[in-house]
């Protein structure tokens, strides 16, 4: 070993070196949170880049760059360090037009903390392992969601467009003439029934157990879907999103109430099955796989 390499190894294995890097990363993170940093922080930025460059040089000199088995670039954690340094020099010395987009990559410096803290390294390692192991569960989840999305598509397509429409029109007005002239929210409220505080017209249905319209209103299928058109089963993709919402239980009770009001109470069976299978079973299966991967990583 050359004297330079020996010195690099000594520095690399020294605990103070890890401490220095750790403190540098944390200080850098603090500086990154500044809203309007003063001019002198530019020099501090250069200092950080210098320390990171020094750290990488020490690692390269001690371990070699990329040829051997345990060299610098053979460790995925060092790829992060390498990218951080490359982007630091790129944003500083190369004029690449939209620099603010490249500045985003400075946030990667915060991720360097992971490679320094051993506990964090274990957790992230487990996370990466779990993602690999999750592929089968993900395929199963997507398959189940797709099947139920197709069922939802068949059962509820267009149902969430059912609205309570005012019966007492002017003599020359028709549903079509009104829909062609409606522009503002105010216009809509004039012809459709809205519950107090609601941003969408009252939903209704044509089956006996679905929601009925109040006196003076009749159920029609017209206009857009609720929630600015985002809640529907009209296409496979929207149905898939709705099912994903059910699986993650993201304000699912609203979707449940909307659909049951438009389609009928009988369809609660569909929601019971989806919540039990998607939300309780599949979510817990995913958690189990993550827990197993973490356990393996710990051992």
């Amino acid at each position: 070993f050359s004297p330079l390499r020996r010195i690099s190894i000594k520095i690399l294995v020294h605990s103070l070196f890890s401490m220095l890097i750790m403190c540098t990363i944390l200080t850098n993170c603090i500086f990154m949170t500044m809203n309007n940093p003063p001019d002198w922080t530019k020099n501090v930025e250069y200092t950080f880049t210098g320390i990171y460059t020094f750290e990488s040089l020490v690692k390269i000199l001690a371990r070699g760059f990329c040829v051997g088995e345990f060299t610098f670039l053979r460790d995925p954690w060092n790829w992060l360090d390498f990218v951080v340094i490359v982007f630091a020099y790129l944003t500083e010395f190369v004029n690449l037009g939209n620099v603010s987009a490249l500045r985003t990559f400075r946030v990667l410096r915060a991720l360097k903390t992971i490679s320094v803290i051993p506990g964090l390294k274990t957790i992230v390692g487990a996370l990466i392992q779990s993602v690999k192991k999750l592929s089968d569960v993900m395929i199963l989840t997507v398959f189940c969601l797709s099947v139920f999305a197709l069922i939802g598509l068949q059962l509820f397509m267009g149902n969430l467009k059912h609205k309570c429409f005012r019966n007492s029109l002017e003599n020359n007005e028709t549903l079509e003439s009104i829909m062609n002239t409606l522009e503002s929210e105010e216009d809509f409220r004039k012809y459709f029934y809205y519950l107090e505080g609601s941003k969408d017209a009252l939903l209704c249905g044509f089956s006996t157990d679905s929601g009925q319209c109040p006196e003076g209103y009749t159920c029609v299928k017209i206009g857009r879907n609720p929630d600015y058109g985002y809640t529907s089963f009209d296409t496979f993709s929207w149905a898939f999103l709705a099912l994903f919402r059910l699986m993650t239980q993201d304000y699912w009770e609203n979707l449940y109430q909307q659909t049951l009001r438009a389609a009928g109470k009988t369809y609660m069976i569909f929601f019971v099955v989806v919540i039990f299978l998607g939300s309780f079973y599949l979510i817990n299966l995913i958690l189990a796989v993550v827990a197993m991967a973490y356990e393996e990583q710990n051992q």
């Epitope: 397509m157 267009g158 149902n159 059912h162 429409f165 019966n167 007492s168 029109l169 028709t174 549903l175 079509e176 044509f206 006196e215 003076g216 009749t218 159920c219 029609v220 299928k221 017209i222």
Partner: nanobody, 124 residues
């Protein structure tokens, strides 16, 4: 496809009575309002009477007290009972309805449908 068919028109003496009916057919889920309109020779089409699905009624001033609109929801039919007819009532009477029906491929559509009309002639 939804169809509205008017019937009951014909020739009647002034002061006489007629009962028009309008039958809606097709895969109908709900009929909202149903209206009668009329169009005399060389005149604009004018509103005559309306009935909503909860049986609220409304009439044009010219026919108030003489005409009565009613409906049979089970049969998807609307009736117009015309009493004390006079020559000014001579026109083609059209039926209009706001219908929600199951159309091609089982999808649901709401729209305004019109009949082809039935001629009522009142002679003096």
């Amino acid at each position: 496809e939804v169809q509205l068919v008017e019937s009951g028109g014909g020739l009647v003496q002034a002061g006489g009575s007629l009962r028009l009916s309008c039958d809606a057919s097709g895969r109908i889920l709900r009929i909202g309002y149903m209206r009668w309109h009329r169009q005399g020779a060389g005149k604009q089409r004018e509103f005559v009477a309306r009935i909503t699905d909860d049986s609220a009624t409304d009439y044009a001033d010219s026919v108030k007290g003489r005409f009565t609109i009613s409906r049979d929801n089970a049969k998807n039919t609307v009736y117009l009972q015309m009493n004390n007819l006079n020559p000014e009532d001579t026109a083609v009477y059209y039926c209009e309805a706001l219908v929600t029906a199951s159309v091609r491929g089982g999808s649901i559509h709401s729209g305004t449908y019109w009949g082809r009309g039935t001629l009522v002639t009142v002679s003096s």
